[in-house]
Protein backbone atom coordinates (compact mmCIF):
# COMPACT_ATOMS: atom_id res chain seq x y z
CA UNK A 1 0.00 0.00 0.00
CA UNK A 2 0.91 3.66 -0.11
CA UNK A 3 2.11 5.71 2.86
CA UNK A 4 -0.29 8.40 4.05
CA UNK A 5 2.01 11.39 4.44
CA UNK A 6 -0.45 13.26 6.64
CA UNK A 7 -0.24 10.39 9.15
CA UNK A 8 3.56 10.59 8.99
CA UNK A 9 3.41 14.32 9.66
CA UNK A 10 1.10 13.82 12.65
CA UNK A 11 3.38 11.11 14.03
CA UNK A 12 6.44 13.30 13.56
CA UNK A 13 4.83 16.18 15.43
CA UNK A 14 3.98 13.85 18.32
CA UNK A 15 7.59 12.66 18.53
CA UNK A 16 8.83 16.25 18.29
CA UNK A 17 6.71 17.24 21.29
CA UNK A 18 7.87 14.19 23.26
CA UNK A 19 11.51 14.93 22.45
CA UNK A 20 11.12 18.50 23.70
CA UNK A 21 9.39 17.55 26.97
CA UNK A 22 11.35 14.42 27.91
CA UNK A 23 14.83 15.07 26.54
CA UNK A 24 14.98 18.85 26.13
CA UNK A 25 15.61 18.36 22.40
CA UNK A 26 14.42 20.77 19.75
CA UNK A 27 13.66 19.26 16.33
CA UNK A 28 13.24 21.77 13.53
CA UNK A 29 10.36 21.35 11.13
CA UNK A 30 10.62 19.08 8.11
CA UNK A 31 8.47 19.16 5.01
CA UNK A 32 6.76 15.89 4.17
CA UNK A 33 4.56 17.36 1.46
CA UNK A 34 7.31 17.62 -1.19
CA UNK A 35 6.87 14.01 -2.23
CA UNK A 36 6.73 12.30 -5.65
CA UNK A 37 3.58 10.99 -7.26
CA UNK A 38 3.05 7.73 -5.32
CA UNK A 39 2.25 5.43 -8.24
CA UNK A 40 4.82 6.66 -10.71
CA UNK A 41 8.06 5.15 -11.94
CA UNK A 42 8.74 8.47 -13.70
CA UNK A 43 11.53 10.35 -11.95
CA UNK A 44 11.29 13.94 -10.81
CA UNK A 45 12.78 16.73 -12.88
Amino acid sequence: GTINVHDVETQFNQYKTEAASRYNLTISDVSVSDVPFPFSAQSGA
Epitope: G1, T2, I3, N4, V5, H6, D7, S31, S33, D34, V35, P36, F37, P38, F39, S40, Q42, G44, A45
Partner: antibody, heavy 121, light 111 residues
Framework: EVQLEESGGGLVKPGGSLKLSCAAS????????MSWVRQTPEKRLEWVAT????????YYPDSVKGRFTISRDNAKNTLYLQMSSLRSEDTAMYYC??????????????WGAGTTVTVSS | DIVITQSTASLGVSLGQRATISCRAS??????????MHWYQQRPGQPPKLLIY???NLESGVPARFSGSGSGTDFTLNIHPVEEEDAATYYC?????????FGGGTKLEIK
Protein backbone atom coordinates in the same frame (compact mmCIF):
# COMPACT_ATOMS: atom_id res chain seq x y z
CA GLU B 1 -11.20 32.43 0.91
CA VAL B 2 -9.17 29.94 -1.11
CA GLN B 3 -8.48 31.43 -4.54
CA LEU B 4 -6.42 30.86 -7.68
CA GLU B 5 -6.13 33.56 -10.34
CA GLU B 6 -4.51 32.93 -13.71
CA SER B 7 -3.04 35.57 -16.02
CA GLY B 8 -0.82 35.81 -19.08
CA GLY B 9 -3.02 34.29 -21.75
CA GLY B 10 -3.41 35.78 -25.20
CA LEU B 11 -3.03 35.35 -28.92
CA VAL B 12 0.28 33.90 -30.13
CA LYS B 13 1.56 32.69 -33.49
CA PRO B 14 2.48 29.03 -34.08
CA GLY B 15 6.03 28.42 -32.83
CA GLY B 16 5.74 31.27 -30.36
CA SER B 17 6.02 31.39 -26.59
CA LEU B 18 3.86 32.51 -23.69
CA LYS B 19 4.21 32.45 -19.89
CA LEU B 20 1.17 31.93 -17.69
CA SER B 21 1.03 32.84 -14.01
CA CYS B 22 -1.31 31.74 -11.23
CA ALA B 23 -1.55 33.72 -8.00
CA ALA B 24 -2.69 31.68 -5.00
CA SER B 25 -4.28 33.02 -1.82
CA UNK B 26 -6.23 31.80 1.20
CA UNK B 27 -4.20 28.63 1.83
CA UNK B 28 -0.65 27.48 2.52
CA UNK B 29 0.57 27.35 -1.07
CA UNK B 30 3.86 25.64 -0.14
CA UNK B 31 1.98 22.64 1.24
CA UNK B 32 0.27 21.57 -1.98
CA UNK B 33 1.21 20.06 -5.30
CA MET B 34 -0.16 22.22 -8.12
CA SER B 35 -1.18 21.58 -11.71
CA TRP B 36 -2.19 23.14 -14.97
CA VAL B 37 -5.22 21.67 -16.75
CA ARG B 38 -6.51 22.92 -20.09
CA GLN B 39 -9.90 22.78 -21.78
CA THR B 40 -9.98 22.65 -25.56
CA PRO B 41 -12.56 24.50 -27.68
CA GLU B 42 -14.35 21.13 -27.94
CA LYS B 43 -14.63 21.18 -24.11
CA ARG B 44 -12.25 18.27 -23.59
CA LEU B 45 -10.23 18.51 -20.34
CA GLU B 46 -6.52 17.67 -20.54
CA TRP B 47 -3.94 17.51 -17.76
CA VAL B 48 -0.90 19.62 -18.75
CA ALA B 49 1.62 19.61 -15.89
CA THR B 50 2.07 18.97 -12.18
CA UNK B 51 4.70 20.16 -9.70
CA UNK B 52 5.21 18.94 -6.14
CA UNK B 53 4.82 21.30 -3.20
CA UNK B 54 8.51 22.15 -2.98
CA UNK B 55 9.16 21.97 -6.72
CA UNK B 56 11.32 18.84 -6.57
CA UNK B 57 9.09 16.58 -8.67
CA UNK B 58 7.65 17.61 -12.03
CA TYR B 59 5.42 15.66 -14.40
CA TYR B 60 4.08 16.23 -17.93
CA PRO B 61 2.06 14.27 -20.48
CA ASP B 62 3.89 13.38 -23.69
CA SER B 63 1.88 15.98 -25.62
CA VAL B 64 3.69 18.92 -23.96
CA LYS B 65 6.94 17.35 -22.71
CA GLY B 66 9.96 19.33 -23.93
CA ARG B 67 7.81 22.34 -24.86
CA PHE B 68 6.17 23.37 -21.57
CA THR B 69 7.85 24.06 -18.22
CA ILE B 70 5.99 24.26 -14.92
CA SER B 71 7.59 26.08 -11.98
CA ARG B 72 6.62 27.73 -8.74
CA ASP B 73 7.77 30.46 -6.37
CA ASN B 74 6.54 29.58 -2.89
CA ALA B 75 7.74 32.91 -1.49
CA LYS B 76 5.42 34.67 -3.94
CA ASN B 77 2.58 32.09 -3.78
CA THR B 78 2.72 31.86 -7.55
CA LEU B 79 2.63 29.01 -10.07
CA TYR B 80 3.98 29.41 -13.62
CA LEU B 81 3.69 27.68 -16.98
CA GLN B 82 6.26 28.59 -19.63
CA MET B 83 4.98 27.47 -23.02
CA SER B 84 7.16 27.38 -26.13
CA SER B 85 6.97 25.94 -29.66
CA LEU B 86 3.24 26.50 -29.45
CA ARG B 87 0.94 24.67 -31.84
CA SER B 88 -2.65 25.24 -32.91
CA GLU B 89 -3.70 22.24 -30.80
CA ASP B 90 -2.48 24.10 -27.70
CA THR B 91 -5.37 26.55 -28.13
CA ALA B 92 -7.43 26.20 -24.95
CA MET B 93 -8.58 27.69 -21.69
CA TYR B 94 -5.76 27.07 -19.19
CA TYR B 95 -6.72 26.43 -15.57
CA CYS B 96 -4.49 26.46 -12.53
CA UNK B 97 -5.62 23.74 -10.11
CA UNK B 98 -4.64 22.63 -6.62
CA UNK B 99 -4.13 18.94 -5.95
CA UNK B 100 -5.66 17.57 -2.77
CA UNK B 101 -5.80 14.24 -1.00
CA UNK B 102 -3.97 12.24 1.64
CA UNK B 103 -1.13 11.51 -0.74
CA UNK B 104 -1.10 14.99 -2.30
CA UNK B 105 -1.84 13.93 -5.88
CA UNK B 106 -5.40 12.64 -5.77
CA UNK B 107 -7.85 15.19 -7.15
CA UNK B 108 -8.18 18.81 -8.26
CA UNK B 109 -10.00 20.43 -5.37
CA UNK B 110 -9.55 24.12 -6.21
CA TRP B 111 -9.62 25.66 -9.70
CA GLY B 112 -8.94 29.14 -10.99
CA ALA B 113 -11.25 30.92 -13.45
CA GLY B 114 -8.84 30.23 -16.32
CA THR B 115 -6.92 32.21 -18.91
CA THR B 116 -7.38 31.78 -22.67
CA VAL B 117 -4.51 30.88 -24.97
CA THR B 118 -5.10 31.10 -28.72
CA VAL B 119 -2.44 29.86 -31.13
CA SER B 120 -3.14 31.15 -34.63
CA SER B 121 -1.35 32.83 -37.50
CA ASP C 1 -2.61 5.67 -20.82
CA ILE C 2 -5.89 4.94 -19.07
CA VAL C 3 -8.77 5.93 -21.35
CA ILE C 4 -11.87 7.24 -19.57
CA THR C 5 -15.14 6.80 -21.45
CA GLN C 6 -18.39 8.57 -20.70
CA SER C 7 -20.64 6.82 -23.17
CA THR C 8 -23.57 9.23 -22.77
CA ALA C 9 -22.73 12.66 -24.18
CA SER C 10 -26.02 14.24 -23.11
CA LEU C 11 -28.82 13.28 -20.78
CA GLY C 12 -32.28 14.73 -20.20
CA VAL C 13 -33.85 14.25 -16.78
CA SER C 14 -37.07 15.66 -15.36
CA LEU C 15 -36.96 17.93 -12.35
CA GLY C 16 -37.04 15.90 -9.15
CA GLN C 17 -36.08 12.64 -10.82
CA ARG C 18 -32.80 10.70 -10.66
CA ALA C 19 -29.87 11.35 -13.01
CA THR C 20 -27.37 8.53 -13.43
CA ILE C 21 -24.09 9.32 -15.18
CA SER C 22 -21.63 6.54 -15.89
CA CYS C 23 -17.91 6.42 -16.50
CA ARG C 24 -15.67 3.53 -17.54
CA ALA C 25 -11.87 3.23 -17.33
CA SER C 26 -9.85 1.13 -19.79
CA UNK C 27 -8.17 -0.55 -16.81
CA UNK C 28 -8.70 -0.67 -13.07
CA UNK C 29 -8.14 2.57 -11.17
CA UNK C 30 -8.54 0.84 -7.79
CA UNK C 31 -5.74 -0.29 -5.49
CA UNK C 32 -5.16 -0.84 -1.76
CA UNK C 33 -8.83 -0.30 -1.00
CA UNK C 34 -9.09 3.05 -2.80
CA UNK C 35 -10.62 3.90 -6.15
CA UNK C 36 -8.85 6.84 -7.76
CA MET C 37 -11.82 8.21 -9.71
CA HIS C 38 -13.27 11.66 -9.15
CA TRP C 39 -16.27 13.66 -10.44
CA TYR C 40 -16.49 17.32 -11.42
CA GLN C 41 -19.36 19.61 -12.36
CA GLN C 42 -18.89 22.42 -14.87
CA ARG C 43 -21.56 25.02 -15.43
CA PRO C 44 -21.38 27.21 -18.56
CA GLY C 45 -18.70 29.90 -18.27
CA GLN C 46 -17.30 28.48 -15.04
CA PRO C 47 -14.31 26.29 -14.16
CA PRO C 48 -14.88 22.67 -13.13
CA LYS C 49 -15.85 22.08 -9.50
CA LEU C 50 -14.98 18.96 -7.50
CA LEU C 51 -18.09 17.03 -6.41
CA ILE C 52 -16.95 13.51 -5.49
CA TYR C 53 -13.45 12.24 -4.77
CA UNK C 54 -12.11 8.70 -4.48
CA UNK C 55 -15.27 7.34 -6.12
CA UNK C 56 -17.71 7.94 -3.27
CA ASN C 57 -16.59 10.78 -0.99
CA LEU C 58 -18.67 13.94 -1.07
CA GLU C 59 -16.59 17.12 -1.26
CA SER C 60 -17.26 19.64 1.50
CA GLY C 61 -20.15 21.97 0.65
CA VAL C 62 -21.60 19.73 -2.07
CA PRO C 63 -25.31 18.88 -1.56
CA ALA C 64 -26.11 15.36 -0.34
CA ARG C 65 -28.25 14.71 -3.42
CA PHE C 66 -24.96 13.94 -5.20
CA SER C 67 -23.46 10.51 -4.64
CA GLY C 68 -20.81 8.37 -6.27
CA SER C 69 -20.20 4.65 -6.44
CA GLY C 70 -18.13 2.03 -8.23
CA SER C 71 -14.74 0.37 -8.19
CA GLY C 72 -12.28 -1.14 -10.62
CA THR C 73 -13.30 0.14 -14.04
CA ASP C 74 -16.97 1.13 -13.67
CA PHE C 75 -18.18 4.21 -11.82
CA THR C 76 -21.46 6.06 -11.42
CA LEU C 77 -22.51 9.55 -10.37
CA ASN C 78 -26.09 9.80 -9.11
CA ILE C 79 -28.06 13.00 -8.58
CA HIS C 80 -31.39 12.66 -6.79
CA PRO C 81 -33.58 14.60 -6.72
CA VAL C 82 -32.35 16.64 -9.69
CA GLU C 83 -32.71 20.41 -9.35
CA GLU C 84 -32.61 23.19 -11.95
CA GLU C 85 -29.13 24.31 -10.85
CA ASP C 86 -27.75 20.85 -11.69
CA ALA C 87 -27.88 21.63 -15.41
CA ALA C 88 -24.18 21.32 -16.26
CA THR C 89 -21.56 19.07 -17.79
CA TYR C 90 -20.15 16.33 -15.56
CA TYR C 91 -16.63 14.93 -15.98
CA CYS C 92 -14.89 11.99 -14.35
CA UNK C 93 -11.11 11.85 -13.91
CA UNK C 94 -8.64 9.25 -12.66
CA UNK C 95 -5.43 9.69 -10.69
CA UNK C 96 -4.32 6.05 -10.56
CA UNK C 97 -1.26 6.71 -12.73
CA UNK C 98 0.29 9.35 -14.95
CA UNK C 99 -0.98 10.82 -17.16
CA UNK C 100 -4.16 11.88 -15.39
CA UNK C 101 -7.01 11.66 -17.89
CA PHE C 102 -10.62 12.89 -17.99
CA GLY C 103 -13.77 11.53 -19.53
CA GLY C 104 -15.33 13.44 -22.41
CA GLY C 105 -18.16 14.75 -20.25
CA THR C 106 -21.90 14.20 -19.94
CA LYS C 107 -24.15 17.22 -20.38
CA LEU C 108 -27.18 17.10 -18.09
CA GLU C 109 -30.33 18.87 -19.26
CA ILE C 110 -33.23 19.40 -16.87
CA LYS C 111 -36.60 18.83 -18.52
Amino acid sequence: EVQLEESGGGLVKPGGSLKLSCAASGFTFSGYAMSWVRQTPEKRLEWVATISSGGTYIYYPDSVKGRFTISRDNAKNTLYLQMSSLRSEDTAMYYCARLGGDNYYEYFDVWGAGTTVTVSS
Amino acid sequence: DIVITQSTASLGVSLGQRATISCRASKSVSTSGYSYMHWYQQRPGQPPKLLIYLASNLESGVPARFSGSGSGTDFTLNIHPVEEEDAATYYCQHSRELPFTFGGGTKLEIK
